[in-house]
């Protein structure tokens, strides 16, 4: 027999298949060309000494055979002697160490077996009632196909779906989808309505990540307040990455998480924008103030479960940074500027009234004042701070009042609103003799000392009646009590006690008049 | 310590709405803020609304927002959680947690609060 010919002789070997789990499979016999035709299979187990002979039966019950030697591949013509335009039937038989080993047969119309190509290019996801549907355009010359696909998950090995028949265009297939893990899918096509035609090879993977994007496990934490008035907030836990099947762990697209980063501003709550989105990697510098932080994870699917954080406000405070004065037109605040064009943010809120809302002005942006001030100001009609009691005022500034991150804490301080001096006047003065030659004066806290760092001290006075000579005791402002030495019996006194604050003398308390008994010897 | 006793819960009908109260007493100045989780029979424990004792700022999970109002009246020590347009899925016992103290916490987490009530159960029926 001539080798490029099928030869219609019993073969050199004896016929009897060893039935082991080794051997030939995969055979596939398809037209390469008008008047080509390719078949080819693989092996399993050991190559040494193997023959391959191919055979062919046809539709008469003539057969024959190729001997192809150790190739797997065989490539003949229409003139071969096999039948391309009627069915056959084709089977590989492997012979080594006296034993022979036969493939599964393929029954097929050799002229109509074309090689079908698997989906190329572009394979679009997609969720579809809780399914996943995958859709891809025909290639060229190829349309009415059978389409399977093939996927596995990190922990399963593959798992062979179909996708039903295919005569379009665009081809599409509805597979299963997972909840929490990732999966790798693979499809295959072939001639539809050929049975015995052999199958495309499988396309490259495609990476399908689970239906919810894992819980973004991470914890944050939150640096000191700089003296640029910004914080540093870090990640203090990554999140934890998916695990992979093993055709979509390189650089594989489609299985991506993707960790965003929302924050959401909770004071100053009259500025241009609350919330601001970024990438997890780009950590944020924050100004004091209270934040909520999402952390949100998404994937080709759209968002998935998120974790927020609750940033607390720094209450550190500076007592002095802050200027208040107060005229007849009305009250103006003034406090180091910052730089050119800044804008500020005003935040107050009644001390021991949290459950309220803090009131908020934005001003317009400003330079610094000669003397490197910035100014707020705001009439008495408007009521502003015009109570009588501790208020918890904070000053932010941004040059880009838009960007959320840019805003930086100026300061953070008390003040006693309304009429101060007044209101702070301490009440319930006292004297109780002390000694032959002094006295105690004792009195109620100022209203003033509710209000942190607000209270500079207490100045008691006393007043010699008979004299008119006047003294006076600057008193700490956490102590109510001071002792009066060097008295004289049997004159009368006044006493009265007033409380400062940095920036205004209180005004005295009323007048308390005393003496010293005098000391009658027996 | 802090003690906190919900009320309010029962039955309701789909559509329906329910209003459950959240009483603390002890050291209750020392509140931060206060949140509403809720548990279904076989289910985890699912995180409702969240609001801080200053200022009001609330939060809520998307299977939620917009139906349920988280509220607080400071000066009864009491947090409300206002249900409107109710699911059978809501269907869960209640419970309400305080948070003490000034430190970075998540929301959304049951480990993060100090102080928990016993829960009133809440059933919407179809």
């Known amino acids: 027999c001539r080798t490029s010919e099928c030869c219609f002789q019993d073969p050199p070997y004896s016929d009897a298949d060893s039935g082991s789990a080794s051997g030939p499979r995969d055979l596939s016999c398809y037209r390469i060309s008008s008047a080509g035709y390719e078949c080819s299979w693989q092996y399993e187990g050991p190559t040494a000494g193997v023959s391959h002979f191919l055979r062919c039966c046809l539709s008469s019950g003539r057969c024959c055979y190729f001997a192809t030697g150790s190739a797997t591949r065989l490539q003949f013509s229409d003139q071969a002697g096999v039948s391309v335009l009627h069915t056959v039937t084709l089977w590989v038989e492997s012979w080594a160490r006296n034993r022979t080993e036969k493939s599964p047969e393929v029954t097929l119309q050799l002229y109509k077996s074309v090689k079908y190509k698997p989906p190329l290019g572009d394979i679009k996801v997609s969720k579809l009632a809780g399914q996943l549907r995958m859709e891809w355009e025909t290639p060229d010359n190829q349309v009415g196909a059978e389409v399977q696909f093939r996927h596995r998950t990190p922990s399963s090995s593959w798992k062979l779906g179909d996708c039903g028949p295919q005569d379009d265009d665009t081809e599409s297939c509805l597979c299963p989808l997972e909840m929490n893990v990732a999966q790798e899918f693979q499809l295959r096509r072939r001639r539809l309505g050929s049975q015995g035609s052999s199958w495309s090879k499988w396309s490259s993977p495609v990476c399908v990540p689970p239906e919810n994007p894992p819980q973004p496990q991470v914890r944050f934490s939150v640096e000191q307040l700089g003296r640029d008035g910004r914080r540093r907030l870090t990640l203090k836990e990554q999140p934890t990455q998916l695990e992979l099947p093993e055709g979509c762990q390189g650089p594989a697209p489609g299985v991506e998480v993707t960790y965003q980063l929302q924050l959401h501003m909770l004071s100053c709550p009259c500025k241009a924008k609350a919330t601001r989105t970024l990438p997890l990697e780009k950590m944020p510098y924050l100004s004091g103030a209270a934040y909520n932080v999402a952390v949100i994870s998404s994937n080709r699917f759209g968002p998935g479960p998120n974790q927020t954080w609750h940033i607390p406000a720094d209450t550190h405070t500076e007592p002095v940074a802050l200027n208040i004065s107060v005229g007849t037109n009305g009250t103006t605040m003034y406090w180091p500027a910052r730089a050119q064009s800044t804008t500020y943010c005003i935040e107050w809120q009644p001390v021991g009234q949290e459950g309220s809302l803090a009131t908020c002005n934005l001003t317009a942006p400003q330079d610094p004042d000669p003397a490197g001030m910035a100014t707020y100001s705001w009439s008495r009609e408007s009521g502003a701070m015009g109570q009588e009691k501790c208020y918890h005022i904070t000053i932010f500034a941004s040059a880009h009042p838009k960007k959320l991150t840019l805003w930086s804490t100026v300061l953070s301080t008390y003040h006693f609103g309304g009429n101060a001096s007044a209101a702070g006047t301490p009440h319930h003065v006292s004297v109780k003799n002390h000694s032959l030659d002094s006295v105690s004066v004792d009195w109620a806290p100022s209203l003033l000392s509710t209000c942190p760092g607000v209270l500079k001290e207490y100045v008691v006075r006393c007043r010699d009646e008979d004299s008119n000579q006047v003294s006076e005791h600057p008193v700490q402002p956490t102590e109510t009590q001071v002792t009066l030495s060097d008295l004289r019996a049997g004159v009368a006194y006044t006493v009265q006690v007033r409380a400062d604050t940095a920036w205004l003398r209180g005004a005295w308390s009323q007048p308390q008049r005393f003496s010293i008994k005098v000391q009658v010897s027996d | 310590e802090v003690q906190l006793v919900e009320s309010g819960g029962g039955l309701v009908q789909a559509g329906g709405s329910l209003r459950v109260a959240c009483a603390a007493s002890g050291r209750t100045f020392s509140t931060y803020a206060m949140a509403w989780f809720r548990q279904a029979p076989g289910k985890e424990r699912e995180f409702v609304a969240h609001?801080?004792?200053?200022?009001?700022?609330?939060v809520y999970p998307d299977s939620v927002r917009g139906r349920f109002t988280i509220s607080r009246d400071n000066a009864k020590n009491t947090v409300y959680l206002q249900m409107n347009s109710l699911k059978p899925e809501d269907t869960a016992v209640y419970y309400c947690?305080?948070?003490?103290?000034?430190?970075?916490?998540?929301?959304?987490?049951?480990?993060?609060?100090?102080?928990w009530g016993q829960g009133t159960s809440v059933t919407v029926s179809s």
């Open positions: 609001i801080l004792w200053s200022g009001g700022s609330t």
């Open positions: 947690a305080q948070k003490s103290g000034r430190q970075v916490y998540r929301i959304d987490s049951w480990d993060s609060f100090d102080y």
